[in-house]
Interface confidence: low
């Protein structure tokens, strides 16, 4: 009679995280008498996964009834697989011995690889706003996927970006991986409504990629333009001067009127007009009593936007 | 008869995202005849929220039956509140006119603030591993919360860290906010099993903070120590020299034996012994046929760990 062989028909098995993995093993003979065990890894550091003879292995079930007469099928199923279960599993036959059973023969091993989905990509923008024509960086991160092959692309308003750098960690073998990408985006004045999208494709997603988004409105500061003009007035002794503050973002804006360099009034912009591109306009006016002035008056509209250094525009009001 | 007053009894209302907000408004008189409207904001840029007379406002329901005779309650409820709904809401009475109704009187306004939970904190480690005694940075990010007040703490294995810097953005008023923190952690040899935790407390979490974690095993490289020794052998013409590679992490390791500078054997570490601290040990041996050598032999054990520059240890084998 030929000597017993331990047959593990699959060299490798790939399973999605959360599923069960079936590891198949068959013997070619009932002799010698003795138990079988399953191990992960080989050599002294191997990890016992299942022992037919004794022990409690809550995640392992046998595919057939091992105590049945003439049973030669020693396949097992491991439930609720996680990336940490990846490795090579060996089905090992022991020969009954005294006091201890003796290892007799091992199967060739079955490599279990675990497919795990990447987490939803998280896109983060710069901590500090920047103005148009400047470059800002956005990062995109996703974790916990396996296998390592993954594709990441960046888009701005549907247009693919090319200036980005991507790392997948760790570089060596691991139970799962992380991806980290940094994209550099040049801001334009029209970017208040713009969006950057980080798209991740992975074999586990069945063609339905994950997307993370960030709004450029969180990253941009569009400084205002100022225009000071005099409006016609019916009353002879009054002049109405307006300051038109245009195309700024974000909202936060404080305006101060100065007459010949002295503060006349300060106000905070509240009811703003929103432009189509997402920037805001605001108008403030100053009524000047011309009787109170002998000479010409220089009126200055001074605007502090989003905590930045003030900008101003002046207007010389002629007292005739 | 006293002139009609528009009463908005609450100066402010705070609502959790996803809930409904009730904005209360009552009139003191049925006269003048004309509809009411609700607006967010005041002035020219205000946004119509509800018009008693016409229009479709799917998220708005009236608290009482507005068409009922003698009704003076014009309170509304807005469903499924998001941070974008924050603002000051005005209940405005119009007087019937021709061709258009004319604004008659406004309530004092009710400020709606929205409480929104922070997203689960995402903790990211360095892209490249570092060795013990070096400092690495971890970042923690969370988004979408309101109000702005938030507390972030870092821990390493339960011990609070102090070397970190945190920003909450944007600096000005916003419908929701993001937090970004960077902690600097000094690695020690025992950190393979260590964890850093970012903990976020916010009013919306009712004292049950959110936590994000990262394992230092992804950030650390513990280089191996080497020891080369000769083992006793029964056979006279053979020498057994072992190279004990101790306390390294991560696993990836390649070992080369050299005899008098010439490569004798190269092997890749597979079955490793894991130490309690998470580092690994491995042993390789070389059988040297002493008959093949006239003079003493220098045996070198050369180890390349995790893609780093090789380290080596030599042993002089005396041929007697």
């Amino acid at each position: 009679e030929d000597e017993l062989q331990v047959i593990q028909p699959e060299k490798s098995v790939s399973v999605a995280a959360g599923e069960s993995a079936t590891l198949r093993c068959a013997m070619t003979s009932l002799i010698p008498v003795g138990p079988i065990m399953w191990f992960r890894g080989a050599g002294a550091g191997r990890e016992l996964i299942y022992n037919q003879k004794e022990g409690h292995f809550p995640r392992v079930t046998t595919v057939s009834e091992l105590t049945k007469r003439n049973n030669l099928d020693f396949s097992i199923s491991i439930s609720n697989i996680t990336p940490a279960d990846a490795g090579t599993y060996y089905c090992v036959k022991f020969r009954k011995g005294s006091p201890d059973d003796v290892e007799f023969k091992s199967g060739a091993g079955t490599e279990l690889s675990v497919r795990a989905k990447p987490s939803a990509p998280v896109v983060s923008g710069p901590a500090v706003r920047a103005t148009p024509e400047h470059t800002v960086s956005f990062t995109c991160e996703s974790h916990g996927f396996s296998p390592r092959d993954i594709t990441l692309k960046w888009f701005k308003n549907g247009n693919e970006l090319s200036d980005f750098q991507t790392n997948v960690d760790p570089a060596g073998d691991s139970v799962s991986y992380s991806i980290h990408s940094t994209a550099r985006v040049v801001l334009t004045r029209g970017d208040v409504h713009s969006q950057v999208i980080c798209e991740i494709a992975h074999i586990t997603l069945q063609g339905d990629p994950l997307r993370g988004t960030a709004n450029l409105s969180e990253a941009i500061r569009v400084p205002p333009t100022l225009e000071v003009t005099q409006q016609p007035m019916r009353a002879e002794n009054q002049a109405n001067v307006t300051c038109q503050v245009s195309n700024f973002y974000p909202r936060g804006l404080q305006l101060t009127w100065l007459e010949n360099g002295n503060v006349s009034r300060t106000e905070t912009a509240s009811t703003l007009i929103e432009n189509k591109d997402g920037t805001y306009n605001w108008m403030s006016w100053l009524l000047v009593n011309t009787c109170a002035h002998r000479d010409d008056v220089v009126l200055t509209c001074q605007v502090e936007h989003d905590g930045q250094q003030a900008v101003s525009k002046s207007y010389a009001l002629e007292i005739s | 008869e006293d002139e009609l007053q528009v009463i908005q009894p609450e100066k402010s209302v705070s609502v959790a995202a996803g809930e409904s907000a009730t904005l209360r408004c009552a009139m003191t008189s049925l006269i003048p005849v004309g509809p009411i409207m609700w607006f967010r904001g005041a002035g020219a840029g205000r946004e119509l929220i509800y018009n008693q007379k016409e229009g479709h406002f799917p998220r708005v329901t009236t608290v009482s039956e507005l068409t009922k005779r003698n009704n003076l309650d014009f309170s509304i409820s807005i469903s499924n509140i998001t941070p974008a709904d924050a603002g000051t809401y005005y209940c405005v009475k119009f007087r019937k006119g021709s061709p258009d109704d004319v604004e008659f009187k406004s309530g004092a306004g009710t400020e709606l603030s929205v409480r929104a939970k922070p997203s689960a904190p995402v903790v990211s480690g360095p892209a490249v591993r570092a060795t013990p005694e070096h400092t690495v940075s971890f970042t923690c990010e969370s988004h979408g919360f309101s109000p702005r007040d938030i507390t972030l703490k870092w821990f390493k294995n339960g011990n609070e860290l102090s070397d970190f810097q945190t920003n909450v953005d944007p600096a000005g008023d916003s419908v929701s906010y993001s937090i970004h923190s960077t902690a600097r952690v000094v690695l020690t040899r025992g950190d393979v099993h260590s964890q850093v935790i970012c903990e976020i407390a916010h009013i919306t979490l009712q004292g049950d903070p959110l936590r994000g974690t990262a394992n230092l095993s992804e950030a650390i490289r513990v280089p191996p120590t080497l020891e080369v020794t000769q083992q006793p052998m029964r056979a006279e013409n053979q020498a057994n020299v072992t190279c004990q590679v101790s306390n390294f992490y991560p696993r990836g390791l390649q070992l080369t034996w050299l005899e008098n500078g010439n490569v004798s054997r190269t092997e890749t570490a597979s079955t490793l012994i894991e130490n309690k601290d998470g580092t690994y040990n491995w042993m390789s041996w070389l059988l040297v046929n002493t008959c093949a050598h006239r003079d003493d032999v220098v045996l070198t054990c050369q180890v390349e760990h995790d893609g780093q520059q090789a380290v080596s240890k030599s042993y002089a084998l005396e041929i007697s």
Partner: antibody
């Protein structure tokens, strides 16, 4: 201009197989999933499955697993669908259409081939 | 699988009429819905993507609305060239599924 050009009509016997082709021109073939859709005479549209040319990754409607096999020839910018064990209920017009690998809404099912009529008859 | 229920299955209308076709998804698909037009013997043509975005070259009398599970295609003033069959298509989740179709015929 983007074009998807499909192979000509086929008349096949029950039990036989047929291989349909769809050649793409006017854009990068490999950036898109190529989808196949069935329309039986006088009936509506049914999604069969799709293939991604970069790595031949496929995704199928369970109903068509075992019936349809999707393949690509990247060098010829051509996608293929083989239908096996044909029966009379497989008589239909088969269309190829495409979507961008990344889920930008504007790129889903905008371009369609002209369709290939497969008639299964003894 | 996500089921797409389209109604009505057919309708008769005159040139100049306002026509509304609805599509209901068996679960939330966000805004990931296309509307397609198909004329006899021709391949389908996409009119609207992402629920409400009009494809270039499609007349502005076509519009789409909705989100989640309820979606509507409206033709504000039916023209002779609009008599065709219209399909909704969800692409939120594989397998991608079509509505049963609505045939718009001349009254």
């Amino acid at each position: 201009e983007v074009q998807l050009v499909q192979s000509g009509a086929e008349v096949v016997k029950p039990g036989a197989s047929v291989k349909l082709s769809c050649k793409a021109s006017g854009s990068t073939f490999t950036s898109y999933w190529m989808h196949w859709v069935k329309q039986a005479p006088g009936q509506g549209l049914e999604w069969i499955g799709a293939i991604y040319p970069v790595n031949s990754d496929t995704t199928y409607n369970q109903k068509f697993k075992g019936k349809a096999t999707l393949t690509v020839d990247k060098s010829a910018s051509t996608a293929y669908m083989e239908l096996s064990s044909l029966r009379s209920e497989d008589t239909a017009v088969y269309y190829c259409t495409r979507s961008f690998y990344y889920s930008l809404d504007a790129a889903w099912f905008v371009y369609w081939g002209q369709g290939t009529l497969v008639t299964v008859s003894s | 699988d996500i089921q797409m229920t389209q109604s009505p299955s057919s309708l008769s209308a005159s040139v100049g009429d306002r026509v509304t076709i609805t599509c209901r998804a068996s679960q939330d698909i966000g805004s990931r819905l296309n509307w397609l037009q198909q004329k006899p013997g021709k391949a389908p043509k996409r009119l609207i993507y992402a629920t409400s975005s009009l494809d270039s070259g499609v007349p502005s009398r076509f519009s789409g609305s909705g989100s989640g599970t309820e979606f509507t295609l409206t033709i504000s003033s039916l023209q002779p060239e609009d008599f065709a069959t219209y399909y909704c298509l969800q692409y939120a989740s594989s397998p991608f599924t079509f509505g049963g179709g609505t045939k718009v015929e001349i009254k």
